[in-house]
């Protein structure tokens, strides 16, 4: 098996959940 | 240095199964949403599945097209977070990112789903 | 699932010169909480994803202000003022108010 590191620019050492839906609920069909 | 190390990637043939981790340092891993999301030249980024912190009792989440033969989980005391990967189909090949809720990205681990 | 289609496909762009892409939703992201959860992601070639914005408009830590976002409910548009040769590479957008998450097909930006 492979292994590979990722190394993200941003220099915040907390991670962000900022970018989601605190309590998401599914999409509803149109 | 925020780093994300993904392992346990493959060739798996069809049916099989393939269980990936990443171990995360650098970061408050225990304060993470921890999604997989996978990247093919035939459907592009898709999220596959997602787990929330203990503040959200670990909730998860997953697409439609993994329910029920994939499982995401994670350890908070070894900065870990896992997918196992079972009834493994060809659509199922790509590569596999480990990312802090879209924030920060591993650099892939290659699953080839192929008889 | 809430479909993101993002506009162009490819653009060419010289250095210095600013560079824009649409990206729409099928439904509105406007989360109950008043936040709209839309994300903006950069691809360089052979590395990994990195966001670049989130919540519309927001910049991550460490990413240039010639990158800005902006948009509301189904329209959304990433700006970059001034382009530069690392921002060669696939823009993404992706939405994160509803399950499942989902990714717009790409925009590739190429340098004259």
């Known amino acids: 098996s492979e292994t590979t590191t990722g190394t993200s620019s941003n220099s915040s050492q907390s991670t962000s959940n900022s970018g989601l839906a605190p309590n998401p609920t599914n999409a509803t069909t149109k | 240095e925020v780093k994300f190390e993904e392992s346990g990637g493959g060739l798996v043939q069809p049916g099989g199964s393939i269980k990936l981790s990443c171990a995360a340092s650098g970061v408050t891993f225990s304060e993470a949403w921890m999604d997989w999301v996978r990247q093919s030249p035939e459907k592009g980024l898709e999220w596959v599945a997602e787990i929330r912190d203990k503040t959200k009792n670990y909730v998860t989440y997953y697409a439609e097209s993994v329910k029920g033969r994939f499982t995401i989980s994670r350890d908070d005391s070894k900065g870990r977070v896992y997918l196992q990967m079972n009834n493994l189909r060809t659509e199922d090949t790509g590569i596999y990112y480990c990312?802090?809720?879209?924030?920060?990205w591993g650099q892939g681990t290659s699953v080839t789903v192929s008889s | 699932d809430i479909v993101m289609t993002q506009t162009p496909l490819s653009l060419s762009v010289t250095i210095g010169q600013p560079a824009s892409i649409s990206c729409k939703s099928s439904?509105?992201?406007?989360?109950?909480?008043?936040?709209?959860?839309l994300n903006w992601l950069q691809q360089r070639p052979g590395q990994s994803p990195k966001r670049l914005i989130y919540q519309v408009s927001k910049l991550d830590p460490g990413i240039p202000d010639r990158f800005s976002g902006s948009g509301s409910e189904t329209d959304f548009t990433l700006k970059i003022s001034r382009v530069e040769a690392e921002d060669l590479g696939i823009y993404y957008c992706?939405?994160?108010?509803?399950?499942?998450?989902?990714f717009g097909g790409g925009t590739k930006l190429e340098i004259k």
């Open positions: 992706m939405q994160g108010t509803y399950l499942p998450w989902t």
């Open positions: 990312t802090g809720a879209m924030d920060y």
């Open positions: 439904q509105s992201l406007l989360y109950s909480n008043g936040k709209t959860y």
